[in-house]
């Protein structure tokens, strides 16, 4: 089924990922800018 394929492969083929994360402070323990996932 589709749901099983989706589970096995992690994400539908051809779907665009989220934008690259932004690390605005340059600090090593910073958290990235939050972006919505685009799945």
């Amino acid at each position: 089924s589709y749901s099983m394929e989706h589970f096995r492969w992690g994400k539908p083929v051809g779907k665009k990922r989220r934008p690259v994360k932004v690390y605005p402070n340059g600090a090593e323990d910073e958290s990235a800018e939050a972006f919505p996932l685009e799945f």
Epitope: K16, V20, V22, Y23
Partner: antibody
């Protein structure tokens, strides 16, 4: 910080692997990009690895480069270099000010 | 793949003046755009992300605007230290058939 290594003079067709090493953070926790800059030219994005390990390449770079990582490093393999691959290669932590200083690859016969 | 078109390739302005650089994306990238400044022999420095948000330590003389496909970087009250090459960068998400990360060709800013 990030540091690239492995750049050197190679002859066309001789594969070369560049290594990106992080200090102060784990590469596997961040999105990492590979960018290059030919002498006197602009920036060119080669490919990237998301923090979850998914890898994507620019269309022109598919089949020419392989991005992989270990627990401590990120590698960029240039499969069969040509003279057009002569450039400084940077690894970059996502969109940020965390860039390595770059490593120079020269491809010449 | 995304294509970023940046104009002009070079611009000259006097100290205290204003420079405007434009960047056009080949398809909508929402606000996933950054601006970098690069000086010879150095890696690029992040100025702006999310099209209009100033990175830490960047003076407010730098202003980014735009969304979708059209973006602008404005540098006001030019200083000699602003002489550099500026790049826009898309950092849109990628897929198996689309690579969303691309740089503009760069704009050299000469300060007189």
């Amino acid at each position: 910080s990030l540091e690239e290594s492995g750049g050197r003079l190679v002859t066309p067709g001789t594969s070369l692997t560049l290594t990106c090493t992080a200090s102060g953070f784990s590469l596997s926790a961040y999105d990492i990009l590979w960018v290059r800059q030919a002498p006197g030219k602009g920036l060119e994005s080669i490919g990237m690895m998301y923090d979850d390990g998914d890898t994507y390449y620019a269309t022109w770079a598919k089949g020419r480069f392989i991005i992989s990582r270990t627990s401590t490093t990120m590698d960029l393999k240039i499969i069969s270099p040509t003279t057009e691959d002569t450039a400084t290669y940077f690894c970059v932590k996502g969109v940020s000010n965390i860039w390595g200083q770059g490593t120079l690859v020269t491809v010449s016969s | 793949d995304i294509v970023m078109t940046q104009i002009p390739a070079s611009v000259e302005a006097a100290v205290g003046g204003t420079v405007t650089i434009k960047c056009q994306a080949s398809q909508s990238i929402d606000s996933s755009l950054a601006w970098y400044q690069q000086k010879p022999g150095q890696p690029p420095k992040l100025l702006i992300y999310s099209a209009s948000t100033l990175a830490s330590g960047v003076p407010s003389r730098f202003k980014g605007s735009g969304s979708g496909t059209e973006f602008t970087l404005t540098i006001g009250d030019l200083e000699c230290a602003d002489a550099a090459t500026y790049y826009c960068q898309s950092y849109d998400g990628s897929s198996s058939s689309y690579y969303g990360i691309g740089f503009g060709g760069g704009t050299e800013v000469v300060v007189k």
